[in-house]
C-alpha cells in the first residue's frame, strides 16, 4: 500500500438526463509528481474527458481546487448529461516525464448510466 493508489469509490453512478454527474476520484499519495486525466472507456480508443494540465473542457468542473497544496481529491462534475455520456469513466494518474508524461496508474472505473429525464 506504500505505492500510490487511485481510488474511484463508486463502481456505478446513475444520473437523469439533463443533470450533472459527479465522478469521485482520490489519490493516496502526492508521489509521483504528474497530472491526472479522466477518460471514458479504456484502451486505444478511449476519449479524453478532462486533462488537469491543459485543454478546454466546458462541461467539466473539478469538485475541489486542484492547485491547492497537498490536494488528493480529483473528482469531477460533468454538466448537462445526455444518453451519449453513458460509459465507464477512468481516473488516471500520469507520472511527469520528458518529453511526455507517462501513464502510471488507473482507477478501477465508474460506470455512468443515464436515466430518462423525469417528465
Amino acid at each position: 500500500e506504500d505505492e500510490l493508489q487511485v481510488i474511484q469509490p463508486e463502481k456505478s453512478v446513475s444520473v437523469a438526463a439533463g443533470e450533472s454527474a459527479t465522478l469521485r476520484c482520490a489519490m493516496t499519495s502526492l508521489i509521483p509528481v504528474g497530472p491526472i486525466m479522466w477518460f471514458r472507456g479504456a484502451g486505444a480508443g478511449r476519449e479524453l474527458i478532462y486533462n488537469q494540465k491543459e485543454g478546454h473542457f466546458p462541461r467539466v468542473t473539478t469538485v475541489s481546487e486542484l492547485t491547492k497544496r497537498n490536494n488528493l481529491d480529483f473528482s469531477i462534475s460533468i454538466s448537462n448529461i445526455t444518453p451519449a455520456d453513458a460509459g465507464t469513466y477512468y481516473c488516471v494518474k500520469f507520472r511527469k516525464g520528458s518529453p511526455d508524461d507517462v501513464e502510471f496508474k488507473s482507477g478501477a472505473g465508474t460506470e455512468l448510466s443515464v436515466r430518462a429525464k423525469p417528465s
Partner: antibody, heavy 118, light 107 residues
Framework: QVQLVQSGAEVKKPGSSVKVSCKAS????????ISWVRQAPGQGLEWMGG????????NYAQKFQGRVTITADESTSTAYMELSSLRSEDTAVYYC???????????WGQGTLVTVSS | EIVLTQSPATLSLSPGERATLSCRAS??????LAWYQQKPGQAPRLLIY???NRATGIPARFSGSGSGTDFTLTISSLEPEDFAVYYC?????????FGGGTKVEIK
C-alpha cells in the same frame, strides 16, 4: 501495517445515543473508505454506512438514515459512528472496516459491543 | 437495494472435502463481489475481491468465480481452520449489502 482500534464496550439505555470511535494507524487515512458494519448476536453482517474522509460526505443504509451519523477527523485519523434513539434490537457488535487497495473492506477493527438494556 | 442470497445456509463436510458456496444477486453487480470468512469472536477477513481475485495472504485452495448475478466460492480441500461462516458482499451500488452467510461445519 494498517491497524484499526475501536473504543470499548458500552451499555446504554433505550432512547439514548452511543458514539463509537475507530482510530486508524498505518497507511493513508484520507483517501480510503471507512465503513461501519454491525452484527447482532448470532446474526449476519449488516452495512450501516461509510465515509471517505477526503470527500467528507457519508453514505448510509436506508434502514439507519436519520438515526446514524458517520464522521471522520483527518487530523487524528479517527472515524466515528453515532447511533441515536437506541432500542434493544441495536444490541450488537459494531465494526469499523477500512478499504484497501482494491475498494473492499480489507482491514477491520476488533469490534465494539454495544448493549442496549433498561 | 441489491439483495444477496447465499446457499446453502449450512454445509456439513469433512476435512479434505471440497466446499462449494453460492451467492446470487437480485440484479447484476458485474464482477464486483467479495467473499469474507468469519470465525466466532473474530472480525471478518477478506478472502476474495472482484469475484475471483484472492486477497493478500489467502491460500490458493480458496477460489471465486462468477459474474453478473451468480457467484461461487470454492474451497478445494477443507483444512480444519476453514470451518467458519462465509459471507458475500457487493460494493457495486449503495447501500452495500451482505448475503446472509453460509456456515461450513464439520460433519
Amino acid at each position: 501495517q494498517v491497524q484499526l482500534v475501536q473504543s470499548g464496550a458500552e451499555v446504554k439505555k433505550p432512547g439514548s445515543s452511543v458514539k463509537v470511535s475507530c482510530k486508524a494507524s498505518g497507511g493513508t487515512f484520507s483517501s480510503y473508505a471507512i465503513s461501519w458494519v454491525r452484527q447482532a448476536p448470532g446474526q449476519g453482517l449488516e452495512w450501516m454506512g461509510g465515509i471517505i474522509p477526503i470527500f467528507g460526505t457519508a453514505n448510509y443504509a436506508q434502514k439507519f438514515q436519520g438515526r446514524v451519523t458517520i464522521t471522520a477527523d483527518e487530523s487524528t485519523s479517527t472515524a466515528y459512528m453515532e447511533l441515536s434513539s437506541l432500542r434493544s434490537e441495536d444490541t450488537a457488535v459494531y465494526y469499523c472496516a477500512r478499504d484497501g487497495s482494491y475498494s473492499y473492506a480489507t482491514y477491520w477493527g476488533q469490534g465494539t459491543l454495544v448493549t442496549v438494556s433498561s | 437495494e441489491i439483495v444477496l442470497t447465499q446457499s446453502p445456509a449450512t454445509l456439513s463436510l469433512s476435512p479434505g472435502e471440497r466446499a462449494t458456496l453460492s451467492c446470487r444477486a437480485s440484479q447484476s453487480v458485474s464482477s464486483y463481489l467479495a467473499w469474507y470468512q468469519q470465525k466466532p469472536g473474530q472480525a471478518p477477513r477478506l478472502l476474495i475481491y472482484d469475484a475471483s481475485n484472492r486477497a493478500t495472504g489467502i491460500p490458493a485452495r480458496f477460489s471465486g468465480s462468477g459474474s453478473g448475478t451468480d457467484f461461487t466460492l470454492t474451497i478445494s480441500s477443507l483444512e480444519p481452520e476453514d470451518f467458519a461462516v462465509y459471507y458475500c458482499q457487493q460494493p457495486y451500488n449503495f447501500p452495500l449489502t451482505f448475503g446472509g452467510g453460509t456456515k461450513v461445519e464439520i460433519k
